[in-house]
Each structure stands twice: as structure tokens, then as C-alpha cells.
């Protein structure tokens, strides 16, 4: 599993009720872990496993640093606004971080944005900055002259960032390394006269990476597919859906294929007739085919024009196969 | 350059009439970060709505998750209304229980 650590900074020239003039937030993967803003002026944990594992002096030390960074960052925004001859609401952002890939390799990144557009990007391999416009070029020249800072940033990205990430992964292991497989169900609905839509829905899964495809007669469908994106449910899990339109008169067989953390689930779309609906779970070398009768894994419900098939992985005993 | 918010309204759990649930309004892809989000029941503002902190995306845009407790019924309508500098008028997106 790939993991990342990212720290964002935001400065706004015209703060509002929800947006203070400076914010800094840290994330491990999609999880907020730390926060600081110009109102609280305190660096605070956003995940319980950060609060539990880092001593008060850590938060105090970084609070002091962030108060300084806040001033520097605000000054940099003012400086850019002068160069662009801009007034009113403008933003300046920074993102620094690293990734630890599944194969053990790493990446590191540091970049800035002005008004939500790339401004300048650090290349840690060439120890140079890529400037996006004439104003960024002024910044590039100043920053590239400072070899100490360039070297520090490279070292931070390649070594210290990865060390912090590994440390945080250890702290949050129960949350970050957990696997919750989705409950998957297919439903059939007449959306317009003469058009039937099959929905394939997955919910309650973590991590958010998931693959979902509709197959027609065993072939993947790329066109005519609507995708809802992976959405946070708000309880630490995610959900998604995929739909396909079809002619209800056709005899094509539609199936929804879901893969999550190495587990594959296959659900046939509900049909008007036929009394056996199948779900296959392929995990490692195990292939599980469950008939509707008496298993309780699949639900086939007739409700107005709605038909539904459901797969709940928690109810399936996979024996000793890896998941 | 302003980015217009994408708004998605959906329930935490598969909806069943009469069964308590959580309604989410996920607002993404907007810039600048100043935004107003309201959740509505039958066109009226729901008073008790919780907001996540402003969240940051790799593409420099922002996202936020608003949510409220609700119990779906056959007749009640739910929506999310978003006001942002990128849009001349606030945008309202209705909850479609099939989505």
C-alpha cells in the first residue's frame, strides 16, 4: 500500500469568517493529522493517534516555528501581489511532502501556487526551481542562489520526510493499515421510458482506492458509463457508484466487477426473470460462487421498478485464504 | 482563476424510509477557499449542520464535507445550497436517493 505525508500552507490577502489569513494542515494519506491557523496560533493534532504519541514539547516547538512561517508566508504573498500589481483577494499556497511506495521506493515534492495556479516547483534531483512565469523567475533566481536551503530541502524530502511518515504510519497503523471491504449491491431502475439503468454501488470501504467496472457479456464497457467518484461517507469509510444504461429488451448479461485491496467481487445485474443470481469473490486462489438460495449474502428485492443484489463481505467465510 | 465547486449530495448508508441516516454534502474543486454551505429540508435551512475543516487538494483546490442527521421519507426533499465567488447565484443540488 502506498502512503503519503503532505503539509499544506495557505495565505489569503482577504480573510473571511471561515478562512483565516494563514492555515497550515498536515495529512497522512487522506487523514488530517495536524492543524495551525492565524486565529488559534497553536499547532494541534487532528488525529487521536497523533495526540497520543507526540509529547507537548513537539506541539510547542512547532507552534513557535509556525508562528514564524506564518509571518514569512504572509510577507511572500504581499511581495507577489506587489510584483503582479494585484489588490483584493489573492491566495498563496505551498505543498511539501513525500510518498512511500509499495515497492519501498520514495518520492518527494515541494511546490507553490499563486491564486490556485502552479507558481514554482522544486526539482530535488537537479536542485533547481521550475518557474511558471516572469514573477516566479525572480523567486527562482533568489532561491537557487541559496545552496544551503536547496540542500536542506532535498535532504528533508528524501530523508526526514520519509522518517516522519514512517513514524506516523506506526502511530496510526490501526487506522491507516486497516482494510474494510465494501458492501456491494446492484440495482435496476427505469430512469426514462424505454431506458433502464443498472447501478453498482459500493459503500463502507477503506482504503479509498477501488476499481469498479461494468461488463457486458464478459467485455468491459467504457462508454455509456456514469461514475460517481469515490466519496467520503463521513465515518472514515468511502462509497462509490457506477451506472450503465441499457435497452431493457436486450438479452445482454451485465455484471459489476469490483476489486478492493486484492479482493475481487462480481455481481450480476438483476434480471426480470431467472431465479439464480451470482456473486463471485476471488481472493488469492479462492473462488467463491454463492447461489441465492439460503445463503443470506444476496438480496433480491422487488420494489416498484427497483431490483437489488447485494454482497456483504463480512458475511462470507473465506477460510484461510489471504484477504 | 476561480474554480467552480462540484457538489454531491448523498447518504452515508443506503437510504431506507423511516430509518435514521446521515446526509452528506461533499463540496470539492473550488477556489478561492471562501465558501458558504447550507443544507435544506423541504427548502428550509437545516440548523444543525456539521462542517469538516477546510481541506486541501494536490491540484490547489479545496474541499469540505458538510453533514446532518436525517430520516428519509417518501415525501421530504433534501438539498445542499452553495454560495461561491465563481458563481453569480448560489447553486442548489437536490438529494437523489438513487445516486
Amino acid at each position: 500500500r502506498t502512503h503519503s505525508l503532505r503539509y499544506f500552507r495557505l495565505a489569503v490577502s482577504d480573510p473571511g469568517p471561515v478562512v483565516p489569513e494563514f492555515i497550515s494542515v498536515g495529512y497522512v494519506d487522506s487523514h488530517p493529522i495536524t492543524t495551525y491557523d492565524s486565529v488559534t496560533r497553536q499547532k494541534e493534532p487532528k488525529a487521536p493517534w497523533m495526540a497520543e504519541n507526540l509529547a507537548p514539547d513537539h506541539w510547542e516547538r512547532y507552534t513557535q516555528l509556525l508562528r514564524g512561517w506564518q509571518q514569512t508566508f504572509k510577507a511572500e504573498l504581499r511581495h507577489l501581489q506587489r510584483h503582479y500589481n494585484h489588490s483584493g483577494l489573492h491566495t498563496y499556497q505551498r505543498m511539501i511532502g513525500c510518498e512511500l511506495l509499495e515497492d519501498g521506493s520514495t518520492t518527494g515534492f515541494l511546490q507553490y501556487a499563486y491564486d490556485g495556479q502552479d507558481f514554482i516547483i522544486f526539482n530535488k534531483d537537479t536542485l533547481s526551481w521550475l518557474a511558471m512565469d516572469y514573477v516566479a523567475h525572480i523567486t527562482k533566481q533568489a532561491w537557487e542562489a541559496n545552496l544551503h536551503e536547496l540542500q536542506y530541502q532535498k535532504n528533508w524530502l528524501e530523508e526526514e520526510c520519509i522518517a516522519w511518515l514512517k513514524r506516523f504510519l506506526e502511530y496510526g497503523r490501526d487506522t491507516l493499515e486497516r482494510t474494510e471491504h465494501p458492501v456491494v449491491r446492484t440495482t435496476r431502475k427505469e430512469t426514462f421510458p424505454g431506458i433502464t439503468t443498472f447501478f453498482c454501488r459500493a459503500h463502507g470501504f477503506y482504503p479509498p482506492e477501488i476499481s469498479m467496472t461494468w461488463m457486458k457479456n464478459g467485455e468491459e464497457i467504457a462508454q455509456e458509463v456514469d461514475y460517481g467518484g469515490v466519496l467520503p461517507s463521513g465515518d472514515g469509510t468511502y462509497q462509490t457508484w457506477l451506472s450503465v444504461n441499457l435497452d431493457p429488451q436486450s438479452n445482454d448479461v451485465y455484471s459489476c466487477h469490483v476489486e478492493h485491496c486484492g479482493r475481487q467481487m462480481v455481481l450480476e445485474a438483476p434480471r426480470e426473470s431467472g431465479d439464480i443470481l451470482r456473486v463471485s469473490t476471488i481472493s488469492g486462489t479462492t473462488i467463491l460462487i454463492i447461489a441465492l438460495a439460503g445463503v443470506g449474502v444476496l438480496i433480491w428485492r422487488r420494489s416498484q421498478e427497483l431490483k437489488e443484489v447485494m454482497y456483504q463481505p463480512t458475511q462470507v467465510n473465506e477460510g484461510s485464504s489471504p484477504s | 482563476i476561480q474554480k467552480t465547486p462540484q457538489i454531491q449530495v448523498y447518504s452515508r448508508h443506503p437510504p431506507e424510509n423511516g430509518k435514521p441516516n446521515i446526509l452528506n454534502c461533499y463540496v470539492t474543486q473550488f477556489h478561492p477557499p471562501h465558501i458558504e454551505i447550507q443544507m435544506l429540508k423541504n427548502g428550509k435551512k437545516i440548523p444543525k449542520v456539521e462542517m469538516s475543516d477546510m481541506s486541501f487538494s494536490k491540484d490547489w483546490s479545496f474541499y469540505i464535507l458538510a453533514h446532518t442527521e436525517f430520516t428519509p421519507t417518501e415525501t421530504d426533499t433534501y438539498a445542499c445550497r452553495v454560495k461561491h465567488a465563481s458563481m453569480a447565484e448560489p447553486k442548489t443540488v437536490y438529494w437523489d436517493r438513487d445516486m
Epitope: L65, W69, N146, E149, N155 | -
Partner: antibody, heavy 120, light 112 residues
Amino acid sequence: QVQLQQSGTELVRPGTSVKVSCKASGYAFSNYLIEWIKQRPGQGLEWIGVINPGSGGISYNEKFKGKATLTADKSSSTAYMQLSSLTSEDSAVYFCARWGYLYYYTMDHWGQGTSVTVSS
Amino acid sequence: DVLMTQTPLSLPVSLGDQASISCRSSQSIVQGSGNTFLDWYLQKPGQSPKVLIYKVSNRFSGVPARFSGSGSGTDFTLKISRVEAEDLGVYYCFQGSHVPYTFGGGTKLEIK
């Protein structure tokens, strides 16, 4: 162990140039910067410039632009400083030092110094 | 350029005394990254300088605990709690935050 071995004493004529070398051993040459420092007899230390042997990046003290030219050869783990158009003002001891990798962001190892005397 | 002003120029001490050297920069030497690259070096006669303190207050490995560094922004101090004979020499502060990097003028620690 880490060592920076500088070339020996130089006695040179005014108007000529000299190339001082600094051979690194005992560490990954490309991972550290090489700084060059001047010390006139009985005087303090003056920063000349810095080179990153890995990227080839160089930064000079404006005062030494046109006077000092910094280079590095990764294959031999050697940094060089060429001083041109020499005058008596250039008579000094020149030090190389490596600067920081990871937690030690400082000039943690220095060469023994190379004495350059400019005299007719 | 950042001017580093060291005081005093000369510091006569008795062995066992405490010694304090000040270094003031003409502008803040905190970098954008939040680092303050402020070092203290000791140079003994006929030798190369040796680092004592880096990044304001971090004692370099092998440096005795009697040496300590402190300060922030523009004001920095090196303290030697009990001076020993081997501590004699010229002390330099150095800022590596803003190009051109600069040394202080030096403080000569000598026996009273």
C-alpha cells in the same frame, strides 16, 4: 574517516592564476556542498562561495565573482577553486569545507588550508 | 549582505571562569524554511576552524557540554561555562542563511 585533502603551498607571480584542489574521501562526495573560505594573515574568515558537486550548482560572494571559479569533478571526488589575475590582496590561506547532509547542517569537516603567496 | 557583528573583539578570562560571546546580525537570519543556519567555530593558531555549535544551539558531536549556544532572529550568544586551557583561540560566528554567507569578525579568547 572523512578527509578533505588540499593541495600544497603556492608561490605565484602577480597577474597569473592558480588552481587549488580539495580531494574528498570517506563519504559520498555528491551528498555534501563544498564551501571555500579565505583567511588573510592575521585576519578573519571570509566566505568565497559554495558548490554542489551533485548538481553543479554554484553560488558566489559577489566580491569574488570574476576572481574565483569553483568546479568539481565527481569521478575523482575533487573540488577546485581557480583564482585569476592575482594580486598581493589574494595572498592568503584558502580553506575548503564540506557543508551539511541531514542533521548536521554545518561545515563539519575542513581541509588543512592552502597557502597562496602572490609575489614578484 | 548580512553583517555579523561580534563582541567583544578580545575576551581575557581566567581558567574556570564563564565566558560569553555575542553575535548580532544586521537582519533576521531565519530562512523561509524556518531554519536559522547560525554556527560557532573555534580556530586555534595554525589550525583549521572547527565547528562547536550549529543551527544556533546544537552542539556538534564530540564538543564538550560546557559549550552552549542560544538566540534567535538577530541576536545570538555562545557561552562557555568553565573555560579550560584548550578553549583558547579565536571564535567566529557564521550565518549560512542568506547569500552571501558571512562570518563575524572573530573574538579572541585569551588568558587574563
